[in-house]
């Protein structure tokens, strides 16, 4: 018996709360596919790689999506 | 105050079915996953299954995978677990949780009794 | 977890969990007291949610997480689990539970 359906996600439960950019090891968004339906936010934890999923429609991780991108386009040369 | 009201509990016989549901309030419920955890008679707890939040995906202890099958409602506001091929071994207090972050369920359903003998 | 744990009023009483690389892991522990549902008490090793008293404190190092109650008294007994999410397999993992008795 399979551990789940087919279908499978990451994200268990999700967070309209943005994370401390300075405690974040790493952001991913993860596309729709045919693993899973939906755009996922994952934000990896410095401390102890605990993963955070972030609610795609709430408009604090959109903020928080747009000012990470804009501190990599700094960085970037 | 957030609420998790449980109902669905009995006495069954060995091989037959059982719905259990948990109805939430007061929280955002399509946003969190939810867990059912069970309590045999003066027994730890044990971690039985969890449904994310949109449903897509599910997860199963051993002893149950394959009998019990988790499911929900985010119209409304519902959880399910329903238990088939029930088993002696089955009794127990069962609860319905809420996920929270890291290792953190806050929130925790009265329980209900079901009881599996012939 | 140790399946009990005496302690006289007013002493401290540590309740241990040991696993494989706790340390790695985030534990939460749950008291719970007959005939009721578990009660969350410490979360993220050592963070304590709103009405918990400041006597109940958690630590996590190595291959153990400890509960610390400080100031027991001779209310209900009470039993504590120590629980952690096992990302691999993603599912949950409770301890034994210690039942914690105030002489």
């Known amino acids: 018996v399979p551990l789940s359906r087919t279908v499978r996600c990451t994200c268990i439960s999700i967070s309209n709360q943005p994370v401390n950019p300075r405690s974040l090891e790493k952001l991913e968004i993860i596309p729709a596919s045919q693993f899973c339906p939906r755009v996922e936010i994952i934000a990896t934890m410095k401390k102890k790689g605990e993963k955070r999923c972030l609610n795609p429609e709430s408009k604090a991780i959109k903020n928080l999506l747009k000012a990470v991108s804009k501190e990599r386009s700094k960085r970037s040369p | 105050q957030v609420q998790l009201v449980q109902s669905g509990g009995g006495v069954v016989q060995p091989g037959r079915s059982l719905r259990l549901s948990c109805v939430a309030s007061?929280?955002?419920?399509?946003?969190?996953?939810m867990h059912w955890v069970r309590q045999a008679p003066g027994k730890g707890l044990e971690w039985v299954a969890l449904?994310?939040?949109?449903?897509?995906?599910?997860y199963y202890a051993d002893s149950v995978k394959g009998r019990f099958n988790i499911s929900r409602d985010n119209s409304k506001n519902t959880v399910y677990l329903q238990m088939n091929s029930l088993r002696a071994e089955d009794t127990a207090v069962y609860y319905c949780?809420?996920?929270?972050?890291?290792?953190?369920?806050?929130?925790w359903g009265q329980g209900t009794l079901v009881t599996v003998s012939s | 977890q140790a399946p009990s744990l005496s302690v006289s009023p007013g002493q401290t009483a540590n309740i241990i969990c040991s696993g494989d690389?706790?340390?790695?892991?985030?534990v939460s522990w749950y008291q719970q007291k007959p005939g009721q549902s578990p009660l969350l008490v410490i979360y993220?090793?050592?963070r304590r949610p709103s009405g918990i008293p400041a006597r109940f404190s958690g630590s996590n190092s190595g291959n153990t997480a400890t509960l610390t109650i400080s100031g027991t008294q001779t209310e209900r007994e009470s039993t504590y689990y120590c629980?952690?999410?096992?990302?691999?397999?993603?599912?949950?993992?409770f301890g034994g539970g210690t039942k914690l008795t105030v002489l």
């Open positions: 690389n706790l340390r790695t892991k985030y």
């Open positions: 949780v809420k996920d929270g972050l890291a290792a953190k369920l806050g929130h």
């Open positions: 993220q090793d050592t």
């Open positions: 007061a929280f955002t419920f399509s946003r969190y996953g």
């Open positions: 449904i994310s939040y949109d449903g897509s995906s599910e």
């Open positions: 629980m952690t999410w096992d990302v691999d397999t993603t599912s949950m993992i």
